[in-house]
Amino acid sequence: QDPYVKEAENLKKYFNAGHSDVADNGTLFLGILKNWKEESDRKIMQSQIVSFYFKLFKNFKDDQSIQKSVETIKEDMNVKFFNSNKKKRDDFEKLTNYSVTDLNVQRKAIHELIQVMAELSPAAKTGKRKRSQMLFRGRRASQ
Amino acid sequence: QDPYVKEAENLKKYFNAGHSDVADNGTLFLGILKNWKEESDRKIMQSQIVSFYFKLFKNFKDDQSIQKSVETIKEDMNVKFFNSNKKKRDDFEKLTNYSVTDLNVQRKAIHELIQVMAELSPAAKTGKRKRSQMLFRGRRASQ
């Protein structure tokens, strides 16, 4: 059994999250994850989910009674989601920490916008994808 | 030329983001994007970047002088990053809107944690990936 299971059960007790009523009004994440089978689509969604959990854990960093549980789960997230790659985790953390109200960050973000946009479509690797990408480009209305 | 280019140039003027000094102290996003070539890794990072831009645009939604530019860029992000798939965009938006301080949201998140964690690793599709997954399990320190 993965180590996070026992610690997640511990967090359930702490947050009083084991009761059946918690599931009322639908799920937060599980229903959304069920919608997406493609790996790249799943990563788009999981990226937001993981950043949510890291934010949540940060809010409880001073609560000693759950520190071991939180640390174990974070470590397991690093293994599973970031494939134990510290650089990947660090880059991710940088992105989640940028303040949207910081004027310098705003200016940089707008400065980089054109290049970021140019990279948003998936790289045309497979024959199928290349074809659909080319169709897209062909379909662009001329400005 | 893609429609966002002209509008992004307009935003550069508005944010005074065209000057060379904006690039001082490195980039926000471009350097990070250069680090990741794998499509799934790129999606992890781009997910955070796109949510940053949507938050930024939301902060300026009442500024009429840049509304057309913002709407055109958002539309192009919807086309490029979400592949014109409204459900993908809606699921993404739900995830970005969850409040980490809402007690009910916290309880639900902890309630779903074990299942979310179980799905974090990419499905072991290729031989190489399967092998590295097994190596990982072998390297696990016993708890």
Epitope: K34, N35, W36, K37, E38, D41, S132, L135, F136, R139, R140, A141, Q143 | D2, P3, Y4, E71, T72, K74, E75, D76, N78, V79, F82, N83, S84, N85, K86, K87, K88, R89, D90
Partner: antibody, heavy 120, light 110 residues
Framework: DVQLVETGGGLVQPGGSLRLSCAAS????????MSWVRQAPGKGLEWVSA????????YYADSVKGRFTISRDNSKNTLYLQMDSLRAEDTAVYYC?????????????WGQGNLVTVSS | NFMLTQPHSVSESPGKTVTISCTGS????????VQWYQQRPGSAPTTVIY?????PSGVPPRFSGSIDRSSNSASLTISGLKSEDEADYYC?????????FGGGTKLTVL
């Protein structure tokens, strides 16, 4: 109330051209992608083309690619479909349709339709 | 190419409940919204369900939409059937570059 009114249909010879227009009202036109859908006599619905809210992205069914051109004039709240090199199999009622999003998305409102007949 | 398959026709008596299915040929039907359109003879289509299960204003709650991931299908259910429900019904989704329609189902109210 959302209203979509198509004009410009009629009888045309094979190889000829026709331009359909769709006048839209009752919503912020530039905020929504628009679509053309057709229905051949006695047949089902077939999607033809779509265009994003700004007009920056366009989409075509394989059956019309290279022959039809979709465009929009957001200042006039009007959608167009330029149909060239028309064939007998293009004979259909053409519906203008509004989608619920700027980049595509579900169709939520339909026009009354306009008959295009391609025949010699 | 992604396709949506519907039964050619269904029939049921007034007051009863009928379900029309729409099955995706590939991928996951849940990865895109499914819409349902009603077309009465000689009229333009109207939307009865959009975004899987949402009803436009003016459409009665007798109409409901659902998604079944296990069978990769969407369903339109009409309860308390009325004679005015007799029409063709089309499902529709999107496959990344095209809007795809099902072949249509003729509903007869007996």
């Amino acid at each position: 109330d959302v209203q979509l009114v198509e004009t410009g249909g009629g009888l045309v010879q094979p190889g000829g051209s026709l331009r359909l227009s769709c006048a839209a009202s009752g919503f912020t036109f530039s905020s929504y992608a628009m679509s053309w859908v057709r229905q051949a006599p006695g047949k089902g619905l077939e999607w033809v083309s779509a265009i994003s809210g700004s007009g920056g992205s366009t989409y075509y069914a394989d059956s019309v690619k290279g022959r039809f051109t979709i465009s929009r004039d957001n200042s006039k709240n009007t959608l167009y479909l330029q149909m060239d090199s028309l064939r007998a199999e293009d004979t259909a009622v053409y519906y203008c349709a509004k989608t619920s999003w700027n980049a595509g998305g579900p169709i939520d409102y339909w026009g009354q339709g306009n008959l295009v007949t391609v025949s010699s | 190419n992604f396709m949506l398959t519907q039964p050619h026709s269904v029939s049921e008596s007034p007051g009863k409940t009928v379900t029309i299915s729409c099955t995706g040929s590939s991928g996951s039907i849940a990865s895109n919204y499914v819409q349902w359109y009603q077309q009465r003879p000689g009229s333009a289509p109207t939307t009865v369900i959009y975004e899987d299960n949402q009803r436009p204003s003016g459409v009665p709650p007798r109409f409901s939409g659902s998604i079944d991931r296990s069978s990769n299908s969407a369903s339109l259910t009409i309860s308390g059937l009325k004679s005015e429900d007799e029409a063709d019904y089309y499902c529709q989704s999107y496959d990344g570059s095209a809007w795809v329609f099902g072949g249509g189902t003729k509903l007869t109210v007996l």
